[in-house]
């Protein structure tokens, strides 16, 4: 089920998610799940042919983020 934004944001800001802080939003299946069920994207080695792990996720709150703010993963920092 789609929801309208909770607040006006810049074009590049992550969209809010309907999850409580205890869960994360899975962009692939578009619903909330336990954060441990998601896999963070990792850099793919050159020439690797195996499928990448599940990605596309939005933790509902990052450390220091306000309630209701979504935090996008930062693959380059993992």
């Amino acid at each position: 089920m789609r929801r309208g934004p909770r607040s006006l944001r810049g074009r590049d800001a992550p969209a809010p998610t309907p999850c409580v802080p205890a869960e994360c939003f899975d962009l692939l299946v578009r619903h909330c799940v336990a954060c441990g069920l998601l896999r963070t994207p990792r850099p793919k080695p050159a020439g690797a042919s195996s499928p990448a792990p599940r990605t596309a996720l939005q933790p509902q709150e990052s450390v220091g983020a306000g309630a209701g703010e979504a935090a996008l993963p930062l693959p380059g920092l993992l």
Epitope: P21, A22, C24, H31, A34, G36
Partner: antibody
Amino acid sequence: EVQLVESGGGLVQPGGSLRLSCAASGFPVTGSYVSWVRQAPGKGLEWVGFIRDKANGYTTEYNPSVKGRFTISRDTSKNTLYLQMNSLRAEDTAVYYCAQVRRALDYWGQGTLVTVSS
Amino acid sequence: DIQMTQSPSSLSASVGDRVTITCKSSQSLLYSSNQNNYLAWYQQKPGKAPKLLIYWASTRESGVPSRFSGSGSGTDFTLTISSLQPEDFATYYCQQYYTYPYTFGQGTKVEIK
């Protein structure tokens, strides 16, 4: 103020059914996740499951120990949640709590005792 | 399922003592994308419902006294009561909500010495 009040506990025979209620006040159940947790007499806590909010289609998650026997639902007009328990076993004897889920299990009711015995 | 192991299972302490309870999980509870550990601590007094003290391993719930603190990351966590008060004698539980089913430690009973 958030308040949760459980009711419906009692004595039931093995194989029987019981429906527990969790009356919520201070918040709308349409916009909240609510969990059920149980505690056998003198034992620790065991998570039963939870129901998500309206934005998530009231989807549910269950502990494998109760999946297929227990069902969580809600009546938004009464701002009440339910735990339907079928095929009850002696090991289901416990105090059953409902709790609002936000950052963890944030607010808890006082619990209702379910005894499964012949 | 993730197993949560608390130690000790019980302890005796006096008012004013510093008390430390540990909790180990069978797998990491750290979600690397936001650096949150999905671990909570609860206090339960006899005949009462549990009360949330700490979430995300180290964030104190609103209204919880500052003498309660949580620390740790990954698989090893600690709840510390810096100066035990008479109202702190209770059973304490850790709980993971990193994945389903949510699981609790077996509890640590803090008794009066």
